[in-house]
Interface confidence: low
Amino acid sequence: AITEAREEAKPYPLFPGPLPGSLQTDHTSLLSLPHTSGYQPALMFSPTQPGRPYTGNVAIPRVTSAGSKLLPPLAFKHTVGHIILSEHKDVKFNCSISVPNIYQDTTISWWKDGKELLGAHHAITQFYPDDEVTAIIASFSITSVQRSDNGSYICKMKINNEEIVSDPIYIEVQGLPHFTKQPESMNVTRNTAFNLTCQAVGPPEPVNIFWVQNSSRVNEQPEKSPSVLTVPGLTEMAVFSCEAHNDKGLTVSKGVQINIKAIPSPPTEVSIHNSTAHSILISWVPGFDGYSPFRNCSVQVKEVDPLSNGSVMIFNTSASPHMYQIKQLQALANYSIGVSCMNEIGWSAVSPWILASTTEGAPSVAPLNVTVFLNESRDNVDIRWMKPLTKRQAGELVGYRISHVWQSAGISKELLEEVGQNNSRAQISVQVHNATCTVRIAAVTKGGVGPFSDPVKIFIPAHGWVDHAPSSTPAPGNA
């Protein structure tokens, strides 16, 4: 428990002289003052310092209607000037004034630091009437004072459109130090200096700061608030806090964890979302970021094929979203995929590898050695070709698509034929004589139609003679 460092200020009595009902006469009028109409400062005796004249904020009323009698000057009586107390204590203070009975509707308002206190404050005004004057006592009470109650309080009274203002009563609420700035959690690079700041205020001042690291004090001697602690560098996570001390006791800040930036943990849960013939869409769950934001990630792709050279394709991507579409892959192939991410410290290890496959694709090469000739006797065109040569199939061959275009004297029409995968020959009927027939062939898989071969043209005469077209693409070794 923190004990009070000083006695509470005792409120002064409301009236230094007799109690209301036998109010002592104000003898100020005995001082020969040159009275004029309106208000002017008057000399009064401070009840707290008897015999010492002071110039208060007073009002000298006009002469009465009878013109025969001067009224005493109006001013709030002196009261306690400064109250010092601890937080959560109760306090009551007041101002008092004697007002001639000729004045009606006198109200007293309380002000704090220049702003009127309205509403739910505990202000009570009591009236003690006498033959000629009414003593008014305005009390203001605060239960369980807070720091926010600190300030300068005054009473104001309006008479004849003029304002009478009391001397200020200063309330100083003292308590344990209050933090205005506490150290913040940080992620720092290993063995690199950084600063922590701590600031606390009273009253009472001064406030002294001690720093604590992992439950041990860092500084032997306290530093006046505010304090900046320069930590030369850490190799392990540490918890820092600061202690603020004043005459009332000590307050401890929140403990903040200072983390050391590290390499990220590997991503987990790499998943396949969609596969096409030449792309795979993957996602992953990022690992622990090592207290440093991820910068980017690397998707590593290895082809799982005894014939492949085992090289790894690397695709760099942003760290977010945790998704990437791997492109430029071979159709109908198996791949092993891993993900690694980096922060400012370095790269994580690679995630557990997962297997994924691309789907069937359209063939990537056209049939070879396309040959076209006219079979006049049957009035048809004979087409021959060789199966496309490729190291790997994009998918299972299901057949061929033949395009033949007939052009003659401004007329052009294209026809398409489909033949089975076992064919390497087809016959199409002559559509138009005295015309050019252009033939192209493409291989077809379940994944789609491949590229068409280069066009091969043959002229179909009106009658009698044959035009033989060469192959479009020589097979390797036949050129």
């Epitope: 290993r190 063995n191 190799t235 392990e236 996570m237 983390n259 050391i260 590290a262 390499i263 943990s265 622990f288 207290y291 410290i345 370095g346 790269w347 290890a349």
Partner: antibody, heavy 120, light 108 residues
Amino acid sequence: QVQLQQSGPELVKPGASVKLSCKASGYTFTTYDINWVKQRPGLGLEWIGWIYPRDGYTKYNEKFKGKATLAVDTSSSTASMELHSLTSEDSAVYFCARGYYDNLYYFDNWGPGTTLTVSS
Amino acid sequence: ENVLTQSPTTVAASPGEKITITCSASSIISSNYLHWYQQKPGFSPKLLIYRTSNLASGVPARFSGSGSGTSYSLTIGTMEAEDAATYYCQQGRSVPLTFGAGTKLELK
């Protein structure tokens, strides 16, 4: 692929010193700590200390201060540990291990170990 | 130092059996700092689980880890012959880094 290659077995006399080495490959050597761990036959694992190759910072288990000295040569990506004033108590397998520093410190790759026998 | 106590010291299990090994710390450690290793005779230890419950690369899904505060455990869902080894827990929260004394898992 991360690999830690350790020097071969050693047979040394009591009172002598010995230097064990650990060559790293397959990753950026300066990014991770190299730790040394002792295992005596039939007993558990004891952490000796770590060295951070980027700046040579070392952290020792109090128990091994004065017994072990850790060093690195970044040009060859090699870490070493010198053991002094050897006694039979130092006969053990010594592992080097890559440390995933710092706040969640674990050893994600280990060397095969070097067997040290101290005998007269 | 943070002393890790493993139990049991030795356990024998048949293939298909479920095994649980516990690790108790003398001081509280966050789950981020507790890791498990597997060591087979004549070999170096191998990271099995990091940060209490994350499987290291290539570790079969039959292994799992859990725990918090001072109490942690490693579970093998269905024991296989290749799982016969010594298992160590390790804390990375405070220096000196410490290991448990190990639990030897034998095949029945």
